[in-house]
Every structure is written in C-alpha cells, then in structure tokens.
C-alpha cells in the first residue's frame, strides 16, 4: 500500500481551522490478522529524508493522536485530550484520514507527517508516511481562508 498527500502545502490565516489530509492507497488487506494504525506528528525537512523526526503536535505525541482499526473502517479520536488542544484526527471508509487543527497560530507553521503502520500477526510492521507543509500567516498578506496547493507527486515514499 501507499500513502498519498492530496495537498503538499496549506496556507492559512491565523485563527482559522485547517484539516490536513492523507489517503491510504493500493491493495489493503482486510483480513482478520491485519490492523492499520494511523497517526500524525510534526517534523522538519531533513537533508536526506522528510518525516525522520517525530515531534509532538501542540504537545500531543503520535501515540496520543493515533487511529486504530482494520482495513478501511472509519475511526476518529474522541479523546478529550486531543480536543482540549484543538485537535481531532479522523478517518473514513475510503482510506482518507485527517487531522483538524482549530484556531491556528503562527506556532503551528511547519512540516506535518501522517504515518500509516500495517500490523500483521508475527510479521514486522510495514510503515509508510506522507508529508505536507502548513504556513500560518498574519497581517495584510494573509489569505482570508485557507489556500491549498496540490501535490505534484501524490505518492509518499515507503520508509521501510
């Protein structure tokens, strides 16, 4: 399977909400012995590869923000913890999954990574990520609403 990032850049005004999105592509085994774990974290653009660092988003780690289910089942983080930080991650039946960040500030600007881990009984994890950039702007040059820029190449790299 692969992870696609429909948009590589989100430019948003301060105070706005934004939903960052990734999509699980390709053959997805829906067997009883496979589980998909999806999560989000912040990173920085490394010289060699993106998403190599795993930093918290608004002090919440990837473990705090994870989604967990089989195949393309829907799931969402109903965690009070996430919502107290203005965050919510969710996924649908079609392989789309997202994180919504409310009331953006300039400190939210940076590189965001989605991570999908396929977990199989007695097999090593298969890990794939996608990356996108969020720019939060303020002042007269800031857009009135979020502007999104499509990815030139939507497929993520496979990191295992």
């Amino acid at each position: 399977f692969k992870v696609a990032t429909p948009y590589s850049l989100y430019v948003c005004p301060e105070g706005q909400n934004v939903t960052l999105t990734c999509r699980l592509l390709g053959p997805v085994d829906k067997g009883h012995d496979v589980t998909f774990y999806k999560t989000w974290y912040r990173s920085s653009r490394g010289e060699v590869q993106t998403c190599s660092e795993a930093r918290p988003i608004r002090n919440l780690t990837a473990a705090d923000l994870h989604l967990h289910h089989g195949g393309h089942q829907a799931a969402n983080t109903s965690h009070d913890l996430a919502q107290r930080h203005g965050l919510e991650s969710a996924s649908d039946h079609h392989g789309n999954f997202s994180i919504t960040m409310r009331n953006l500030t300039l400190l939210d600007s940076g590189l965001y990574c989605c991570l999908v881990v396929e977990i199989r009984h007695h097999h090593s994890e298969h890990r794939v990520h996608g990356a996108m950039e969020l720019q939060v702007q303020t002042g007269k040059d800031a857009p009135s609403n979020c502007v999104v820029y499509p990815s030139s190449s939507q497929d993520s790299e496979n990191i295992t």
Partner: antibody
C-alpha cells in the same frame, strides 16, 4: 501515571518454566496502539528484547527465543504474562516489562525482577 | 537481525564536559532509533526517540542525531546525575536490538 510491575518467582530450576506477570496500573492494557514487551538483562550485561504483544493480541518474538517463549494478555486483570520454558543458567537475568507505542520505542518500564536459574 | 554497535564501550569524563556516544546499525534503519540511560539497579529510561526527538521531561543537554546507519548521542555539558550506562536501540524491524552499552564514568 502509568505503572508496570513485574512479579513471579525469583528462583527457577533448570529445565523448568519461568513464569512472570506484568501488572499495569494507571492505564488499560487493551488500549489500542500499544505493544507490551519483555526485555531481559543478564547480570552485568546488556539488554535483550524477548518479545512484544500488541493490544489486539498479535505477538512478536525474538527468533533466538521463539521456540521457548509465550507472551499472553489477561485484559480482565490488566496483566501481561511471560512464559519461558526449558530454562538454563543462561536465562538468569533481570526481566523487565515495558510499553511501546506503535512505531515507537519503549517509553514506560517496570522496575524489573531478577530471576535466577539454579538447581 | 540488525546488529547495533556502540562506541566507545566505556568513557571517562568530567562534570561540564561535552560527550558524544556513537551507534552504528549493520543495515539502514531510517530514523527508528532510541537512546536509553540506565543507572545501577534501575530500569532503563528513554532519552531520545526517532534518532533526534527528545523524550518528554528529558533535559535539553541531551541531543541525538543521525539517520540510516550512523547515530550519535551528545550530552552538551555533563552533570553529576548523567554518569550511567547508555544504550541505543533500533525499532525499524523485528527483532528489536540494542547496542552493547556505553558506560560513562567520572574521571
């Protein structure tokens, strides 16, 4: 605050089965997105991963021990268990249980329990 | 299995020194590497994950770097409580493996 506590006999005879239990408090062992692992450390030596159990029951074992090890979970007691059969003196070690989120390292550890294999 | 090799195996240093410990993986592990600190008769404590991310509550004098096969743990200014044994661990693939440890002693 998550706490992990290992318990079990401190002395096991050669060829017998080592049985340890890890009791989790301050969190649920069935919480999705986590593995519960066992690591051991022979006296004066380094760390060796024994195996891990995923919250949904999937297990992963170190090939060097796979034929002798079983890790299981009892969600009603919030416990994870380790069984290692046919032990020898080389299995004398401090045994730790630890938690690690998916695609992450061991972030919470028990204090460890020393198991000596001796006749 | 992926072999993790730490160097040096032991190191003597003084309070205030800058110390670097290296860890090499026998094959590429991306950034799936952690560093732990262990004091005598205690369980290991996680310091660094994802090669360079600081575990919550760990002092900022600890830092990690590297990707692929070569990694380093740096303590910018040694404090008395930092004298301990340090281990690297790869969690790129099973079986998870640890380095043999680096014992940091007072000079």
């Amino acid at each position: 605050q998550l706490q992990l506590q290992e318990s079990g006999p401190g002395l096991v005879k050669p060829s017998e089965t080592l049985s340890l239990t890890c009791t989790v408090s301050g969190g649920s062992i069935s919480s999705s997105g986590y593995y519960w692992g066992w690591i051991r450390q022979p006296p004066g030596k380094g760390l060796e991963w024994i195996g891990s159990l995923y919250s949904s029951g999937y297990t992963y074992y170190n090939p060097s021990l796979k034929s002798r090890v079983t890790i299981s979970v009892d969600t009603s007691k919030n416990q994870c268990s380790l069984k290692l059969n046919s032990v020898t003196t080389a299995d004398t070690a401090v045994y730790y249980c630890a938690r690690h989120p998916v695609a992450m390292n061991f972030d919470d550890w028990g204090q460890g329990t020393l198991v000596t294999v001796s006749s | 299995d992926i072999q993790m090799t730490q160097s040096p195996s032991s190191l003597s240093a003084s309070v205030g020194d800058r110390v670097t410990i290296t860890c090499r993986a026998s094959q590429g592990i991306s950034s799936w590497l952690a560093w732990y600190q262990q004091k005598p008769e205690k369980a290991p404590k996680s310091l660094i994950y994802a090669a360079s991310s600081l575990q919550s509550g760990v002092p900022s004098r600890f830092s990690g770097s590297g990707s692929g096969t070569d990694f380093t743990l740096t303590i910018s200014s040694l404090q008395p409580e930092d004298f301990a044994t340090y281990y690297c661990q790869q969690y790129n693939s099973y079986p998870y493996t640890f380095g043999q440890g680096t014992k940091l002693e007072i000079k």
